[in-house]
Each structure stands twice: as C-alpha cells, then as structure tokens.
Amino acid sequence: MTSGSVFFYILIFGKYFSHGGGQDVKCSLGYFPCGNITKCLPQLLHCNGVDDCGNQADEDNCGDNNGWSLQFDKYFASYYKMTSQYPFEAETPECLVGSVPVQCLCQGLELDCDETNLRAVPSVSSNVTAMSLQWNLIRKLPPDCFKNYHDLQKLYLQNNKITSISIYAFRGLNSLTKLYLSHNRITFLKPGVFEDLHRLEWLIIEDNHLSRISPPTFYGLNSLILLVLMNNVLTRLPDKPLCQHMPRLHWLDLEGNHIHNLRNLTFISCSNLTVLVMRKNKINHLNENTFAPLQKLDELDLGSNKIENLPPLIFKDLKELSQLNLSYNPIQKIQANQFDYLVKLKSLSLEGIEISNIQQRMFRPLMNLSHIYFKKFQYCGYAPHVRSCKPNTDGISSLENLLASIIQRVFVWVVSAVTCFGNIFVICMRPYIRSENKLYAMSIISLCCADCLMGIYLFVIGGFDLKFRGEYNKHAQLWMESTHCQLVGSLAILSTEVSVLLLTFLTLEKYICIVYPFRCVRPGKCRTITVLILIWITGFIVAFIPLSNKEFFKNYYGTNGVCFPLHSEDTESIGAQIYSVAIFLGINLAAFIIIVFSYGSMFYSVHQSAITATEIRNQVKKEMILAKRFFFIVFTDALCWIPIFVVKFLSLLQVEIPGTITSWVVIFILPINSALNPILYTLTTRPFKEMIHRFWYNYRQRKSMDSKGQKTYAPSFIWVEMWPLQEMPPELMKPDLFTYPCEMSLISQSTRLNSYS
C-alpha cells in the first residue's frame, strides 16, 4: 500500500527513517551493496526473491513503502475496523448510554446498530461518543437528526440508502472527528451541510453518486485532514480554490471518478496537501501550474488516466514529492528533464507507458530513487542507479537472459535442431524417392525449406540468448529495435506463412483428387511452379511489409525479445493490430479451416466409397489406417494453430495475456508443424518407406555377400512394425498407386483409399 504512506508516517512520527545500512559501501553504477559487507551485486540480483548476498541484504527493504507500512496500518486501523461487525473498542464493557434501541449493541459510550433494519437515526442519550448505523435502510438524514449528540466523535453511516441529506442534518455534532458516508446514494452535498463539523478530521464518502463539488461544499471543515471521494461520478473539479474551507487538508483521494481536466486554481489553497490520489479518472489535460501550490506534496498518483502530454515544468514545484505514479496513461513523450526537480523522489511508476525516447538522462537526477516501475523490463537498463526496478521479466526474457526459463533456453536448441535436421534430411532424401511425382516433390521440398526457416529463426534466437547471457538487460532495448530482430522476426513470419499456404495448397490438391476424382486434372509443371512462386512472394510480402513503414507499424517485430508479433499491445499502432489480426485470424485461420474441412471431406468421401466394397475386413483396416493418418495431419495442425488463434482472439478482446505465453508458443507450439511436417508428409509415406527398405535391403545384401556370399532378405520387422502413421499393411499395397495424387484419377472408387500418400 503505497498511496499516502509517507504522509501518515510524518503525521504520526514527524520524521523519516533512513534506508537501512550499508550505504557507506561504494559500488559502481548499476551495482548495490550487500548491507555492511563489501560485496556489491548488480541491480537485477536485488529484490529478485533469491538471497544472492548470503546475508539476505539484497532482499531487505524491497517493499515500496519506504518503511512506513506498519505506521500506515496503525493509523488506518480504525478505518479498517469500520467494516467489521463491532467497530468499537470501548474501555469498559458495560453500557453507559442511557436509552438504547432494543436491537442495538452497546459498550461503554459506544453504540452499534449495524444491520438492524433501521429506517431513521435512533434517539439515544446525548453522551454517546460513537454510533455505528451501517447496513441499515436509512434513506434520508433530516434536519437536526444528530442535534443532541454533542459528544459524538465517530459516526458510521456506510451501506445505507441515503439519497438526501438536509443542510441541517449534522447540526450540533461539534465533537465529531470521523464521519463515514461510503456506499450510499448521495448525489449532492449542500454547501453548509458540514458547517458544525469544525473538529472533523476524516470524511469518507466513497462509492456514492456525487456529480459535483465546490469549495463551499466543505464549508466548516476547518480541521479536516483526510477527504476520500473515491468512486463517485465527479466530472470536474472547480476552477476555484478547493481547499478554501479545509486549510489543514493533508490527504485528498479522488480515485475512480470521471474528472477530465485539472484547473490552475483548484489546488491554490491546498498548501498542506501531502497526498493527492487522482488515479482512474479521465484526465486528459494538465496545465503547467496545476500542482504549483502543492509544495508539501509527498505523493501524487495520476495513474490510469488519459494524459497524453506532460508540460515540461509540471513537477517543478514539487520539491517534497517522494512517490509519483503516472502509470497507464497514453503519454506520447517524456521530456528528458521532466523529473529534474523531483530531488526527493523515491518511487516512480511509469507502467504501461511506451517511452520511445527513453534515456538515462531522464532518471539520473533522481538520486534518492529506490523503486521504479516500467512497462517493459528492458527499460530498467536506463535506470541503473535504482535498486528495485520492475518488471524484471516480460515472461519471455528476464533482466539476465533473453529467454527467461531454463527449459526454453535448452529447448530452443533442441526444437531448432529437430526442425532443421528433419527438413534438411527430407530435402536431401527426396531425390532418392523414385516413385515420387516430381511436381509433388517440388512442393514438399518447398514446404521443407519454409519449415527449415523456422529452425533457423530458433537458432538465431538461441544464439542471441547465448550472446546476451547474464546481461540481457543491457542490450534488450537495442536488440528489440535492431535490424537483426526485425529480420529474424520476419523470417519467422515468412516461414509460418509459406508453410501455411503450402499446406493449404497441397491439401486442396489432394481434396480435389479424392473427392472429385474424375474431375481431377493433373496439374502441369508450369502451374505448380507458378503457385509455389506466388506462395513464396506472398510470404515475403506478408513478412516484410511491416519493415517498410515504421510510422504505420511502429516496432512491429520488436515488441518482445523473441521478435515474434503474436499478440497486440495496447500501445501498438492500430495498423499493426489490424495487420496482425489479418494474418493470424485472417489468412491462417482461413487456411486452418480449409485444411480441417478438406481432410474431413476426403475421409468422408473415401468412407462412402468403401461402403460398397466387398472386402469388408480389409476396407475397415484400410479406413482405420487412413483415418489415423488424416487425424495426425489435422491434429498437428490444430495443436499448432488453435493455441495461436486463441491467444490472438483473446488479445483482440483486450484480455491480458501473460508474456510467458508468447515464448512458449514461439518455442514449443509454432514449430510443431515445422518439425512434424517432414514426418507427416515424407518420412511416413509409402514411397519413403520403400526407399528405406530398398537401402536397407541393398545394404544387407552387400554385407551378406561380403561376409558369406549369401542372399538375405530384409527383416520382416520393417513391414510388420506398425508405424504410428503407417497407411496400410503391405499386403494391401499397390505400388503403382503411390504416385502424385492426381495420377489416380481413373482408378475405381473402391480402390481410392489406397491412393493417399
């Protein structure tokens, strides 16, 4: 709980704690001492949950409360207690209040009438000092309803149905110090309603329907210290001195309203204000002098607003500020000298802000800064003198490594090796498959080339992970903006798109031949080559368009360390978002649907023709084998693409997706197709197994002749063993059918399922 901790500590104890020992030890920039010992550790090892110092010093004082959270909680204890069933702790157990309503509880001079279905303020003796009327059915506070309670100090009216408060409702409450009106239906407070509350210190009006306030609203609140107006519907603050009648106001909480701008005069009288919370509003404009009068301000929270521009000197008078939150604003640019005047700043929140012009100069003057929060952990490198920098990972990378997880760091090599080896092996072996149709082979080699690019992409990512090992944070920002990252990212997209389009092309060819065998015209060399060229050109265009227009696409590939543009960031340009969606939910989803539909139709067509066949047992066997093959082709496609579609779709719905997802997708899911395509389309097909069998047979024969000069036969296990994707048992094999699918166009319907290769 950071908001206002500073103020409450000062309020109670009147002085600051120092930041702990070890400050005598001098460490170089980016390093921090391990308490009193001479050891220094880099920023990334402090506050990372691991005892790297050996004496726990690197994990001490990591909480962003500057050591005051306990005091803060103590000060607020009674505020928290108000929601409990018994908000009072009277010194004497017996009731000292005269007349007490039968359903109420009483202890000392304190009265608890919570949840008693009261419709009006009860009448009790005038010596009562605390009265809790929470969770009742009170709708109106009429004139003089508390007039006799001159000793009342605490009044709890939360969770009623109050809509109307008479201007004289609180008349006579001269001793009241705390008034809670939260969770009611108050829409307006009449100027003068608090006139008699000159001892009131806390006024809590959270979760009501207040739409406007003005300085006269608070007339009479001379002693007010804390004013909480959270979660109302205020649209503006007055262009008049808000604190005119609250000269002692220290804490103003306006979180969760609809305020859209701050005026120059609003805070002119708030010279004692220590904490100002204005997060979750709709502030879009700030004037240079808005905060000028707040020279004692310790915390300023402007998070989650609509601020686009920060005037250069907006913080120049905030000499006492120790916590500043600007998170989640669409700030376009931060001036290099924006924070120069905040010499006492200890905590700075810039989460959710894309700082395109980030530089060390911005944060260097903040010598007391101990906590900083960014949108991207890569920015931490620009604040090396700040001990605690968050986030320390984006789920993909960490401060130390491009790939945060050890599993990913190992498997990026395994997967890339499998992908590259499998595809290169197929490319090399294809010419040896005699019965293979040359055009079909060309398509398969093309597919393997595309898939091989995915392996190369993973190799490059793995290589840079090795290169940056242990100090990735120093290079992160530059790496993500580098040409290398852009090129390697476009390589991944090129691979993905060409692979997807080729699979769709191959599938459609098979689909036409199997479902419409008599319409199947064998594709000519010219057409096949044209299609392949078009697919590659399309892939190149899709992959490289984002590099051609930086204005439109921003840093399309450099949104994460693995340079893969999977899900949209809030700050990503609309163009980039649309483009990304068009690829993943347009081209790829359409292709996936075509593939699933085609294989379904093919299987159905084969199944239908098999019904008329005579050899029932053999047909069923064949169908099962075919079904298994089709299932694995569709299943691997689904395994690869469904998670990607889901992630993309969720990001489109603004669902927050953990950064870890991207890295797991890129290393384990995206390459599934690239790694398995060689197996599915080559290594398990009959022609390939024939070729292997031939090699094996020849090899054994040679070996046999060399040793005994005898003829041997290939061992039966080659044929007996059921490969997971084996099409059919050898006795059903018709070698003349294992050719390009369209060559079977004149084959009878009953033998059609033999033809699938």
């Epitope: 009449k190 003068g192 006139e195 001892r199 300085p215 009479g220 001379n222 009648h245």
Partner: antibody
Framework: QVQLQQPGAELVRPGASVKLSCKAS????????VNWVKQRPEEGLEWIGR????????HYNQKFKDKAILTVDKSSSTAYMQLSSLTSGDSAVYYC????????????WGHGTTLTVSS | DIVMSQSPSSLAVSAGEKVTMSCKSS????????????LAWYQQKPGQSPKLLIY???TRESGVPDRFTGSGSGTDFTLTISSVQAEDLAVYYC????????FGGGTKLEIK
C-alpha cells in the same frame, strides 16, 4: 447573467389564495436556495422562508408557516410561493432572492411582485 | 429568535462625508467553529430591490466600491461609508444568518 423574473403586480380578494412565481435564469437552478422576503410599504424586510430546488428541502420563518407554501418546478427553473387566506396585512412587495455560494447571504434579488389584497 | 436592532433609523450627510451605522444583535453571531460572524449588509435604493454589500460582517461582495466597509464581531457591527456619494442614497439593512434569517429595521441614508 443571473436573473430572477417576477410578475410586477397581483391583485386578489381577501380570503383567496395567490401563487407568486420567480423564474430563474443564468445559473444552475438546482444548486442554490431560493428565498422569499416580504416588505410592507415603508417597512423593513421580513424573511418568509427558503427552498432548495435540488430536493425541495424547505425552511420557514415560524411566523409564515401557515401562510406560505413554497414549491419549485425544476423543469422550468421556477420557484413558487402560494399565499393563502389573504388579508390586507398580506399586501406587500414579495421578493425572491437567490442564496449565495454559501446560503447565508442573498446575492441576487428579483424585482419583486406587488401584491394587493383588496375587495 | 434573534432580534436585530439598527441605529440610527435615519441620517442625513453631505456628499464626501464619512458615515457609520450600527447594528446590534440579541445573540452572539460569531460561529466559533468557522470563526465567521454571520452578518450581512444590504443596500436598497428607492424603488429597487435590495443588493448585497457585505457578508461575514466584513467581506465585500464583488463589484461593491471599496468605500463600503463592514466591521465588528459577536453582537456589535458597523457599516462605514468612507466618502458618501450621491448614489449611496438608500436604506441599509443588516441581516443575521446565524439562526435562520432576521433583518434589522434599516437605516435610511439621505444626502443633504
């Protein structure tokens, strides 16, 4: 600019009732109290009562509690005062006045309606 | 009820002279909490409606010439016109707002 428009004069018979109007413009009607003040010829000012147009909270001078009824019509930004059982003693100029930022003073006044009760 | 008494009931002065008029309250008008005196002064020129001059006993309403000054605290209050002008011919009323509202009988200012 702030204006409170009142009819110039009303003539009514004794025992009858009259409803005086005060139409406000130039400010947010529901944000400020409307007060009514009586001034007899060559006499001082007497406060009759006030109404908050926001929720129709009303406070009366006890002397006029049975004489005057205050109402508002938010849609037309108009305040009304109905005087009943009229006598010659009710003949006077009746002013409406807008409460200030704080309602302890009256920062704008209407021109007044001269009520004459006569048979 | 709080009773407000004004004196003198009328006075005649020459243009340029200084004039003071008094207003006494039957009760203390100082709010100890807000430290404000709940007293206002109004000017009513012949044939016109009243106009606010001073509130909180001494705060001049915007647009009011600075020759008008309010002073006093508790039960005794004074309105001073430092240099009377011809247009100041009017009846001046004090009004308490400590407990509802009560006007004084008024002081009629005439120009010699």
């Amino acid at each position: 600019q702030v204006q409170l428009q009142q009819p110039g004069a009303e003539l009514v018979r004794p025992g009858a009732s009259v409803k005086l109007s005060c139409k406000a413009s130039g400010y947010t009607f529901t944000s400020y109290w409307v007060n009514w003040v009586k001034q007899r010829p060559e006499e001082g000012l007497e406060w009759i009562g006030r109404i908050d147009p926001y929720d129709s909270e009303i406070h009366y001078n006890q002397k006029f509690k049975d004489k005057a009824i205050l109402t508002v019509d938010k849609s037309s930004s108009t305040a009304y005062m109905q005087l009943s059982s009229l006598t010659s003693g009710d003949s006077a100029v009746y002013y409406c006045a807008k409460g200030g930022e704080l309602p302890y003073y009256f920062d704008y006044w209407g021109h007044g309606t001269t009520l004459t009760v006569s048979s | 009820d709080i009773v407000m008494s004004q004196s003198p009931s009328s006075l005649a002065v020459s243009a340029g002279e200084k004039v003071t008029m008094s207003c006494k309250s039957s009760q203390n008008l100082l709010n100890s909490g807000t430290r404000k005196n709940y007293l206002a002064w109004y000017q009513q020129k012949p044939g016109q409606s009243p106009k606010l001059l001073i509130y909180w006993a001494s705060t001049r309403e915007s647009g009011v010439p600075d020759r008008f000054t309010g002073s006093g605290s508790g039960t005794d209050f004074t309105l001073t016109i430092s240099s009377v002008q011809a247009e100041d011919l009017a009846v001046y009323y004090c009004k308490q707002s400590y407990n509802l509202w009560t006007f004084g009988g008024g002081t009629k200012l005439e120009i010699k």
